[in-house]
Interface confidence: low
């Protein structure tokens, strides 16, 4: 017999099965071109001189044999003596050590046995009613397959499933989604109502995150606020990585779970864009406004739970770096002035009613004054900062206000509203006997004490009402209470105080008279 | 809300055919494969085919072989098993079933009783 | 062809919990449907898959599987679910659909 030739004699061996668990096995065989075939098997066991028979029994009942020696692939033409237009019967008998071992018999018309590719390219991935829908384009002249899918998790192996029969120029298939775990999926094809046909190879891996994206546990710190009037966040702690099966844990497409981080400036709420979203890699610099924080988990199933944090304002104030002055047309803010063309949020509110909105202005893009300054004017009408209280007002700058993390901190103050002037007198002076000639002077302290860093001073003026002479004493404003002494006894003295801001002095309090009685000796 | 309905009961001669239909409705008839499973009186669950509804391919169990038929109309969303040359053994309960991703019977039709009698 | 082997009868008393099993080489490689059938009715699918219930199933049904077994567990059996139970898988061999014979559980 020709070695090209399917030999039409007895094999030269016994032909009774040894019955072993190991030998030929997964025999394929299909047409590789229009006249040429191929027959592939895998073998179960030692190698070492084994002889592989490729046996084929034709329709007529006639079988024939090809000898591969330790070859498990045989290929052939439509001209070695087997119909390929017909059914037949083949399987494939391994000779070793004086034994012969018998592979699982596959029938088929060879002419219409086609390899069968896996799905190639793109393997659209969706949810579909809580399960996974996997779509993909019918390999070239494949219509009409048998598709199956194997899938696993990280912790468990392969197991097989079905999509079925499918006879379109695309296939899909259903496949279980898992809530919490990745999966990596594999799906072969092989040709439509056809027993003995071969599977195709499996494709490559598809990588399917969970249904739920896993919950972002990261931490953050907040850095001090800079001179730039900025402070950095940062990750403390990094979102946990997703647990992968073994074939997703290269550069998987389809499986990563992106962060983004969400910021929510809650300051200065008259600005353009208050929400801006960016990838968790790039952790902002923030200005020392308030904030919310939210990490959003997502993957290709869209978003998933999210994580928020409230970053407080930072409360850090500029000792008066801003200036008021009151005129009769309105009142003027002056503070040192950042970059030309920069856009500047003046927020203000009440003390005490921080859960309350602020109130804020932005002003037009401005370059500094001669001064080095920057400015914001407001008329008596408007109402602004007229209640005679104390305010907090924080200024943000930016040359970019709709680039939310282009915002700084200019400063933050207070500053006391309306007539302060009159507002801050204090009230209640009162004037006791201290010594034979000193007294003491007390008052209530200011409404301007209540707005840090306002009242620069108190000042004590003692008239003589004999000689209209007057001194005056500066008293810190955390003081209420003075010390007049060199008086003379019998001399009528008038006193009064006033409260002084640093850019504002304040009214004098109603004279308060007052004399120290002679002392007549016995 | 997602059902099958199936034709009424039958009685045929020994040799002749039955064609049993199923009508499905409350969800996307392409998408979901249709079996066909029938049970013989006091007996168990046997599988006789499956159907694509997408495409109208078929695969049925060796037994039935030559001898049953499975199609389908999209334009009324229904799916026709027949069987031919019956025999007395074919008495049975025909069900129509719509499978999931794992090939289980999520929906079944009420059955269909064949009865085969000379 | 494979066949899938079920016990033709297990019984168990009112509350207890009962284990059905289903043997059959395609399971070392598919999952089981599990189905409930009572007399004159179609069967109802319990459950498929790994483990999962369709809607409306009570969760004392769970399943299971190793190598080439599959099981039902019903944990607290009800008189109600006195009935007959298939199981059924892919046949390894040629991809068709088998059935067990099916087990008839009666609560005592």
């Known amino acids: 017999c020709r070695t090209s030739e399917c030999c039409f004699q007895d094999p030269p061996y016994s032909d009774a099965d040894s019955g072993s668990a190991s030998g030929p096995r997964d025999l394929s065989c299909y047409r590789i071109s229009s006249a040429g075939y191929e027959c592939s098997w895998q073998y179960e066991g030692p190698t070492a001189g084994v002889s592989h028979f490729l046996r084929c029994c034709l329709s007529s009942g006639r079988c024939c044999y090809f000898a591969t020696g330790s070859a498990t692939r045989l290929q052939f033409s439509d001209q070695a003596g087997v119909s390929v237009l017909h059914t037949v019967t083949l399987w494939v008998e391994s000779w070793a050590r004086n034994r012969t071992e018998k592979s699982p018999e596959v029938t088929l018309q060879l002419y219409k046995s086609v390899k069968y590719k896996p799905p190639l390219g793109d393997i659209k991935v969706s949810k579909l009613a809580g399960q996974l829908r996997m779509e993909w384009e019918t390999p070239d002249n494949q219509v009409g397959a048998e598709v199956q899918f194997r899938h696993r998790t990280p912790s468990s192996s392969w197991k097989l499933g079905d999509c079925g029969p499918q006879d379109d120029d695309t296939e899909s298939c259903l496949c279980p989604l898992e809530m919490n775990v990745a999966q990596e999926f594999q799906l072969r094809r092989r040709r439509l109502g056809s027993q003995g046909s071969s599977w195709s190879k499996w494709s490559s891996p598809v990588c399917v995150p969970p249904e739920n994206p896993p919950q972002p546990q990261v931490r953050f710190s907040v850095e001090q606020l800079g001179r730039d009037g900025r402070r950095r966040l940062t990750l403390k702690e990094q979102p946990t990585q997703l647990e992968l099966p073994e074939g997703c844990q290269g550069p998987a497409p389809g499986v990563e779970v992106t962060y983004q981080l969400q910021l929510h400036m809650l300051s200065c709420p008259c600005k353009a864009k208050a929400t801006r979203t960016l990838p968790l890699e790039k952790m902002p610099y923030l200005s020392g406004a308030a904030y919310n924080v939210a990490v959003i988990s997502s993957n290709r199933f869209g978003p998933g739970p999210n994580q928020t944090w409230h970053i407080p304002a930072d409360t850090h104030t500029e000792p008066v770096a801003l200036n008021i002055s009151v005129g009769t047309n309105g009142t003027t803010m002056y503070w040192p002035a950042r970059a030309q063309s920069t856009t500047y949020c003046i927020e203000w509110q009440p003390v005490g009613q921080e859960g309350s909105l602020a109130t804020c202005n932005l002003t037009a893009p401005q370059d500094p004054d001669p001064a080095g300054m920057a400015t914001y004017s407001w008329s008596r009408e408007s109402g602004a900062m007229g209640q005679e209280k104390c305010y907090h007002i924080t200024i943000f700058a930016s040359a970019h206000p709709k680039k939310l993390t282009l915002w700084s901190t200019v400063l933050s103050t207070y500053h006391f509203g309306g007539n302060a002037s009159a507002a801050g007198t204090p009230h209640h002076v009162s004037v006791k006997n201290h010594s034979l000639d000193s007294v003491s002077v007390d008052w209530a302290p200011s409404l301007l004490s209540t707005c840090p860093g306002v009242l620069k001073e108190y000042v004590v003026r003692c008239r003589d009402e004999d000689s209209n002479q007057v001194s005056e004493h500066p008293v810190q404003p955390t003081e209420t209470q003075v010390t007049l002494s060199d008086l003379r006894a019998g001399v009528a003295y008038t006193v009064q105080v006033r409260a002084d801001t640093a850019w504002l002095r304040g009214a004098w309090s109603q004279p308060q008279r007052f004399s120290i009685k002679v002392q007549v000796s016995d | 809300q997602v059902q099958l309905v199936q034709s009424g009961a039958e009685v045929k001669k020994p040799g002749a055919s039955v064609r049993v239909s199923c009508k499905a409705s409350?969800?996307?008839?392409?998408?979901?494969?249709i079996h066909w499973v029938r049970q013989a009186p006091g007996q168990g669950l046997e599988w006789m085919g499956i159907?694509?509804?997408?495409?109208?391919?078929?695969s049925y169990a060796q037994k039935f072989q030559g001898r049953v038929t499975m199609t389908r109309d999209t334009s009324t969303t229904t799916v026709y098993m027949e069987l031919s040359s019956l025999r007395s053994e074919d008495t049975a309960v025909y069900y129509c079933?719509?499978?999931?991703?794992?090939?289980?019977?999520?929906?079944w039709g009420q059955g269909t009783m064949v009865t085969v009698s000379s | 062809s494979s066949e899938l082997t079920q016990d033709p009868a297990v019984s168990v008393a009112l509350g207890q919990t009962v284990r059905i099993t289903c043997q059959g080489d395609?399971?070392?490689?598919?999952?089981a449907g599990w189905y409930q059938q009572k007399p004159g009715q179609a069967p109802v699918l319990v459950i498929y898959?790994?483990?999962n219930r369709p809607s409306g199933i009570p969760d004392r049904f769970s399943g299971s599987s190793s190598e080439d077994t599959a099981s039902l567990t019903i944990t607290g059996a009800q008189a109600e679910d006195e009935a007959d139970y298939y199981c059924?898988?892919?046949?390894?061999?040629?991809?068709?659909?088998?059935f067990g014979g099916g087990t008839k559980l009666t609560v005592l």
């Open positions: 079933a719509k499978s999931n991703w794992a090939y289980a019977f999520d929906i």
């Open positions: 409350g969800y996307t008839f392409t998408s979901y494969y």
């Open positions: 159907i694509n509804p997408s495409g109208g391919s078929t």
């Open positions: 395609s399971l070392s490689s598919y999952y």
């Open positions: 898959g790994k483990n």
């Open positions: 059924n898988s892919r046949d390894s061999s040629d991809n068709h659909l088998v």
